[in-house]
């Protein structure tokens, strides 16, 4: 056969569908690869051909469109299963061609099983609701095109295994599920089951999504730098290790990029000729507020390094903040010699072993490897 533009296996379109449910799959060529739509292609005399490779097979074979009750059919650029079977899993190819033109793409289709609580290997979309924010809704996804607008389906909503009937703050309203006020306890998987008739048969569409309750924009604040702060002085002798944690709290903000960085004498650490390492850790609260800690470390600090300015910076969609760490060179304490080896002479050794940071105002000390919150 003549050359065909082969877009290969489009793994971005990892399509998962439930066993024994209708599925309509659009040929990805018109969605992502070609600059024209199916109607244009069709009126230009191009034909769309479908074929597939079964799971764990290499052999490409035509799709059987002559199954009882038209179980598999094609309509324009859509491949229909009414319904799917487990062994429909495989790689499907749609090819657009005429005598002078050919373009094709393959995509994987996985038919998955669900249990009575709608658990399955299906990757679930996540819908974020703001905590205590007033009425918010989720909508039963990906049901367009399955039935005409004249058909009135029945929709049943579930939370986990449980049909939502008398929930005190969650109300099913057709294709929508309304949360009167969202709390952390509303986190979980919600499923809509859409039941509709077609040609004397009844079909079910099952759609599950994960609800995650997140911090409200009403409560969002600019980044808060907990460390460094005015209560901690990093006092070191040359040759010691200098460790300064920068700990920043970020309110949850939808689609916000949270950034933390250090500057040394106003420059990025990479642009300074000293051996600095920076380690970052990130933790999240239940409402996805974020705490980022970047620990700046200089293994063997010099007296030059102890004169530099160390500033922690943070930025989110809510604003930018910065805080300088107080770094000093430790003045060696005078050595007391007391007859008989008793008295306070041992204090220097204790202080030396502790390698302390002074907390001004409080008189507390922490080991240098502790994070200061």
């Amino acid at each position: 056969s003549e050359r065909c533009d082969d877009w290969g296996l489009d793994t971005m379109r990892q399509i998962q569908v439930f066993e024994d449910e209708p599925a309509r799959i659009k040929c990805p060529l018109f969605e992502h690869f070609l600059k024209f739509n199916y109607s244009t292609a069709h009126s230009a005399g191009l034909t769309l051909i479908w074929y597939w490779t079964r799971q764990d097979r290499d052999l490409e074979e035509p799709i059987n469109f002559r199954l009882p009750e038209n179980r598999i059919s094609k309509e324009k650029d859509v491949l229909w299963f009414r319904p799917t079977l487990l062994n429909d899993t495989g790689n499907y190819t749609c090819m657009l061609r005429n005598t002078t033109y050919c373009s094709k793409v393959a995509f994987p289709l996985e038919v998955v099983q669900k249990d009575s609580c709608f658990n399955s290997p299906m990757k679930l979309p996540v819908h974020k609701l703001y905590i205590e924010y007033g009425i918010q809704r989720i909508t039963c996804p990906n049901v367009d095109g399955y039935f005409p607008s004249s058909v009135k389906p029945t929709i049943t909503w579930y939370m986990g295994c449980y049909k939502i009937q008398n929930f005190n703050n969650v109300i099913p309203e057709g294709m929508n599920l309304s949360f009167l006020i969202a709390f952390i306890s509303n986190n979980g998987n919600y499923t809509c089951v859409v039941t509709y008739p077609e040609n004397g048969r009844t079909f079910h569409l099952t759609r599950t999504l994960t609800v995650k309750v997140v911090g409200s924009p009403k409560n969002a604040v600019p980044p808060v730098i907990h460390s460094p702060n005015d209560h901690v002085v990093y006092e070191k002798e040359p040759g010691e290790e200098l460790l300064i944690p920068c700990t920043v709290y970020f309110s949850f903000l939808m689609d916000s990029r949270n950034e933390v960085w250090w500057t040394i004498d106003g420059k990025k650490p990479d642009d300074i000729p000293i051996d600095v390492t920076i380690n970052e850790s990130i933790s999240h609260s239940r409402t996805e507020d974020e705490t980022r800690t970047q620990i700046l470390s200089i293994k063997k600090v010099t007296s030059e390094d102890l004169k530099r300015s160390y500033v922690c910076h943070a930025r989110s969609a809510k604003g930018e903040v910065a805080k300088a760490a107080t770094v000093k060179q430790k003045v060696p304490a005078p050595r007391y010699t007391v007859e008989g080896g008793g008295g306070t002479g041992g204090l220097n050794d204790i202080f030396e072993a502790q390698k302390i940071e002074w907390h001004e105002g409080g008189g507390h000390h922490h080991h240098h490897h502790h994070h200061h919150h």
């Epitope: 609580c117 939370m159 929930f167």
Partner: antibody, heavy 119, light 107 residues
Amino acid sequence: QVQLVQSGAEVKKPGSSVKVSCKASGGQFNDYAIHWVRQAPGQGLEWMGYIIPAYGQAEYAQKFQGRVTITADESTSTAYMELSSLRSEDTAVYYCARVPYSTAYFDYWGQGTLVTVSS
Amino acid sequence: EIVMTQSPATLSVSPGERATLSCRASQSVSSNLAWYQQKPGQAPRLLIYGASTRATGIPARFSGSGSGTEFTLTISSLQSEDFAVYYCQQYNNWPWTFGQGTKVEIK
């Protein structure tokens, strides 16, 4: 560790009511449904109904509809099962069991409460 | 409602032998089936869910199989602590229902 501690044994007269409690500890009370299952002497297990404490929704088996009420108090992490119009055939051990929302089997059970209905 | 029928009602087995317990559903429950063990004076204990998945801490001698309407619980080599009553439970449809139990006793 998860524990469900039920109230003590009860002896009741026919026609009266009984209210059995089930206090949960070790795990978020609001992340689970609490089910009630009973077992008559020498008999099998019989599912009665459930409550989802976080949402206040209770559902009952048809057989017990109108006679059973399941409630929950989130502040004390305690679920209650009240059975009214008691008859001798309600003599049984009543169990509460915890079920995560996304599963449908009973992973943790209370120790059981014997309710004896006798005149 | 779905009726679960267990057989036999009583199974007499010697320690170290294999025990095979049966559970039949009046209609398909897919793999939505659990097995429990109950000893006298105790609450039931979850052994198997999803027809074949062992619950946490359950020894490997317990195994479940089947789907649809026919299910089996197998205890490969009976230990003294395994003599008890075993129940199957379907959770495919509401109301969830139990079998009447199989008593495994010492032969």
